[in-house]
């Protein structure tokens, strides 16, 4: 009765358990009772990343600059090329097949997390006491100016989009306050 299973680094062919080819090599010929599996290294710009019985190596991924892509890590005979996006852009998927511009946070919103090559900007609404008056992919919400520390008073209240406006203290009220 021929074998129905093989060990993990083997494959079943013609009632034989043949050795798989190591990562970085492709199958040229199956083993026989008297000859070992024959494997050959992948060519330039090709790879195989597992123990395998593939007769063709895979082509390295091309990081197309027209899609905003650049090489993050050059491929080897055992690994694929890893692409990332140009500065200011991020990948549209985990496979990073194309890029989109980082999103900006509108006025009233600040950057919670700056975008990376693989994740977009994360914005958050500016809470009470903070504001953002610009559309930006980098600016956080800024705290309102503290008029008191400048010995000024609030002349106009702040919003999530505007800072408070400080002005001088009322001299008369100030005078009465001290007498």
């Amino acid at each position: 009765e021929p074998p129905t299973a093989c060990r993990e680094k083997q494959y079943l062919i013609n009632s034989q358990c043949c050795s798989l080819c190591q990562p970085g090599q492709k199958l040229v010929s199956d083993c026989t009772e008297f000859t070992e599996t024959e494997c050959l290294p992948c060519g330039e710009s090709e790879f195989l990343d597992t123990w395998n019985r593939e007769t063709h190596c895979h082509q390295h991924k091309y990081c197309d600059p027209n899609l905003g892509l650049r090489v993050q890590q050059k491929g080897t005979s055992e690994t694929d090329t890893i692409c990332t996006c140009e500065e200011g852009w991020h990948c549209t998927s985990e496979a990073c097949e194309s890029c989109v511009l980082h999103r900006s946070c509108s006025p009233g919103f600040g950057v919670k997390q700056i975008a990376t090559g693989v994740s977009d900007t994360i914005c958050e609404p500016c809470p009470v006491g903070f504001f953002s008056n610009v559309s930006s992919a980098f600016e956080k919400c800024h705290p309102w100016t503290s008029c008191e520390t400048k010995d000024l008073v609030v002349q106009q209240a702040g919003t999530n989009k505007t800072d408070v406006v400080c002005g001088p203290q009322d001299r008369l009220r100030h005078h009465h306050h001290h007498h």
């Epitope: 129905t4 299973a5 060990r7 993990e8 009632s15 358990c17 190591q22 083993c31 008297f34 070992e36």
Partner: antibody, heavy 127, light 107 residues
Framework: EVQLLESGGGLVRPGGSLRLSCAAS????????MNWVRQAPGKGLEWVSY????????DYADSVKGRFTVSRDNSKNLLYLQMNSLRAEDTAVYYC????????????????????WGQGTMVTVSS | DIQLTQSPSSLTASVGDRVTITCRSS??????LAWYQQKPGKPPKLLIY???SLEGGVPSRFSGSGSGTDFTLTISSLQPEDFATYYC?????????FGQGTKLEIK
């Protein structure tokens, strides 16, 4: 230290059942294929069963097929051999053994061997 | 199933002797063969894998050769600790099988 320790052996009546365990330590158990090998008193070695690292693939000697089941719990570093419908001829010392794949990237395809063995547990099937 | 036949079944030799044990397979197994040493009351110990590769820590007086169907284990100069039983095993395909063993005794 890399170690395998079998337990669960003992005296059992013909037709009875027994579950052997093999506790692994000192290595990443879940990365290795494992085997059970037995040795009847005064006799040679007999391969009994094989299990892949994930437990997905198993194989058995014809003499135990349909009666013995090999399994593993990688979270507990344990290998098992469930033995049912035991016969007198199953009397033996049972060893668990680690399969290792030796590989030299510059050489020919790699080779297997059983590089770590437990001390064995005795199973006696007798009425 | 693949049968392995070891010869001789037993062998008497002296310290310093060169000893050869053979293992013949019923079908070609390329170099998918291992050799083990076993002493009474102990588990087997791996000596050779892939027909000719020496396991780490095994003395260089042990060597293996062969491919296909015919294999040999050679001990170039027997030491007192080498008196034991030796087994070949094919790991080419399931079911894995062992030779019947060669008992090496002191003269």
């Amino acid at each position: 230290e890399v170690q395998l320790l079998e337990s669960g052996g003992g005296l059992v009546r013909p037709g009875g059942s027994l579950r052997l365990s093999c506790a692994a330590s000192g290595f990443t158990f879940g990365s290795y294929e494992m085997n059970w090998v037995r040795q009847a008193p005064g006799k040679g070695l007999e391969w009994v069963s094989y299990i892949s690292s994930s437990g997905e693939t198993t194989d058995y000697a014809d003499s135990v097929k349909g009666r013995f089941t090999v399994s593993r719990d990688n979270s507990k570093n344990l290998l098992y051999l469930q033995m049912n419908s035991l016969r007198a001829e199953d009397t033996a010392v049972y060893y668990c053994a680690r399969d290792v794949f030796f590989f030299d990237s510059s050489g020919p395809p790699g080779a297997y061997g059983m590089d770590v063995w437990g001390q064995g547990t005795m199973v006696t099937v007798s009425s | 199933d693949i049968q392995l036949t070891q010869s001789p079944s037993s062998l008497t030799a002296s310290v310093g002797d060169r000893v050869t044990i053979t293992c013949r397979s019923s079908q070609g197994i390329r170099s998918s063969l291992a050799w083990y040493q076993q002493k009474p009351g102990k588990p087997p110990k791996l000596l050779i894998y892939g027909a000719s590769s020496l396991e780490g820590g095994v003395p260089s007086r042990f060597s293996g050769s062969g491919s296909g169907t015919d294999f040999t284990l050679t001990i170039s100069s027997l030491q007192p600790e080498d008196f034991a039983t030796y087994y070949c095993q094919q790991l080419n395909s399931f079911p894995s099988t062992f030779g019947q063993g060669t008992k090496l005794e002191i003269k």
